[in-house]
């Protein structure tokens, strides 16, 4: 069954800055993400941001920046202006909607150990990066290997017969044994979130700049698409009309202009799956 995870972090450099990370684990495509605080969406929670995979983002104070991190995860940066830091005890909730299949919501708050009131400085969540783990593991193994070889050489010097030398086969076996723990540690310490490719993130469209539309890729959970899958059709300015052939919304009682470019209200953002599935564009 689909799941939603929520992680709240305090920035180590600025005690007044918080970041909420949310992700969707499951099949299906995400049609909308809402982030709220103080409770779940529709149950006393206050909206902070709404993110649409094709049309951009909308956010409200104290939200500073909402953005897509991957095709199925988002982050929201918050600026805490108050001196008492109300975020420290606040619950943040993320709701992932997949219309019309269903919606899934989960909540989380800042871990108590990250409270700025404590003497210990706030630390980020201890995620050991896979590449770092690999380097540390490899250097440890090499260090051990060198020590072991030195030990063997010293033992050889003290032996009376010079004929006993480590064969080529033995050294190969030694090398193989030295590498195996490194590979195992890399596999064991590999964190799936540490190596997420963030090249799928769309440009965010804040409502403060309604005319700053850009072309955006279609996002579908668990359907990774490279930059080549990005849409080429631009999303056009607000207040525009939809062409008749696309069969989309037009202002009540008005006709789409017959001259000039055919401006669309439902952008034809074609990505991994045709937008027909999302907007009904023909």
């Amino acid at each position: 069954t689909p799941e939603v995870w929520v992680q709240v972090q305090m920035e180590a450099t600025e005690l007044s800055s918080f970041t909420v990370h949310c992700g969707f684990l499951g099949p299906g495509s995400i049609s909308l993400v809402t982030v709220s605080w103080g409770g779940p969406d529709g149950a006393g929670g206050t909206k902070l941001a709404v993110l649409h995979p094709e049309l951009g983002t909308r956010q409200w104070a104290p939200a500073r920046q909402a953005r897509w991190e991957t095709q199925s995860s988002i982050s929201l940066a918050l600026e805490d202006s108050g001196a008492s830091s109300p975020f420290a005890n606040t619950t943040f909730c993320c709701k992932f909607a997949s219309f019309p299949e269903g919606s899934w919501e989960s909540c989380g708050s800042l871990p108590p150990s990250s409270d700025p009131g404590l003497s210990a400085p706030p630390t980020p969540v201890p995620i050991l990066r896979a590449d770092l783990a690999g380097i540390l593991g490899l250097s440890g193994v090499l260090l051990f290997g060198c020590g072991y070889l030195l030990h063997l050489l010293r033992r050889q010097k003290h032996r009376p017969t010079p004929r006993l030398q480590p064969s080529h086969t033995n050294s190969q076996a030694l090398t193989a044994q030295a590498w195996a723990p490194s590979q195992a540690s890399q596999a064991a310490l590999h964190d799936p979130y540490a190596t997420i490719n963030t090249s799928f993130c769309p440009a965010t469209l804040d409502t403060a700049h309604p005319n700053g539309w850009a072309s955006l890729p279609t996002h579908a959970a668990h359907q990774p698409q490279g930059p080549a899958a990005s849409a080429s059709t631009p999303i056009l300015a607000r207040g525009s009309f939809v062409s008749v052939e696309n069969g989309l919304y037009t202002q009540a009682g008005e006709r789409p202009p017959h001259t000039g470019p055919g401006l669309t209200l439902f952008p034809d953002c074609r990505g991994p799956r045709a937008v027909e599935g999302r907007f009904g564009v023909r």
């Epitope: 909308l32 809402t34 529709g42 206050t46 409200w60 019309p100 607000r238 009540a252 209200l265 907007f279």
Partner: nanobody
């Protein structure tokens, strides 16, 4: 929790009329549009009509002049009056509340849907 319950669907002959209703509860102040989407059998989702928080209705081109969307704030209800129905209007109709992105109402919550069948 936001709850939307549609009613009024059914079987109707071409040229006939139907009135869909949607009873809403648990609204949040920042939801800024309410409307109807539909999904025809084997087809994609299509926005039919929506009303902004300012009360301005918007329609998909194929239903203009035939469908009328209205809202009763006192009853927390949304309606869709469908006249001159055609076979191509056959679909499951969903009542939605959502957020505006330009002139598009992105669904945040929706009902279970009501089936409208236009057939002779």
């Amino acid at each position: 929790e936001v709850q939307l319950v549609e009613s009024g669907g059914g079987l109707v002959q071409p040229g006939g009329s139907l009135r869909l209703s949607c009873a809403a509860s648990g609204f949040t102040s920042r939801t800024d549009c309410m409307g109807w989407f539909r999904q025809a059998p084997g087809k994609g989702l299509e926005g039919v009509a929506h009303i902004d928080s300012d009360g301005i209705p918007r329609y998909v081109e194929s239903v203009k002049g035939r469908f009328t969307i209205s809202r009763d704030n006192a009853k927390n209800s949304l309606y869709l009056q469908m006249n001159s129905l055609r076979a191509e209007d056959t679909a499951v109709y969903y009542c939605v509340v959502g957020f505006k992105f330009g002139d598009y109402c992105a669904p945040n919550d929706w009902g279970q849907g009501t089936m409208v069948t236009v057939s002779s």
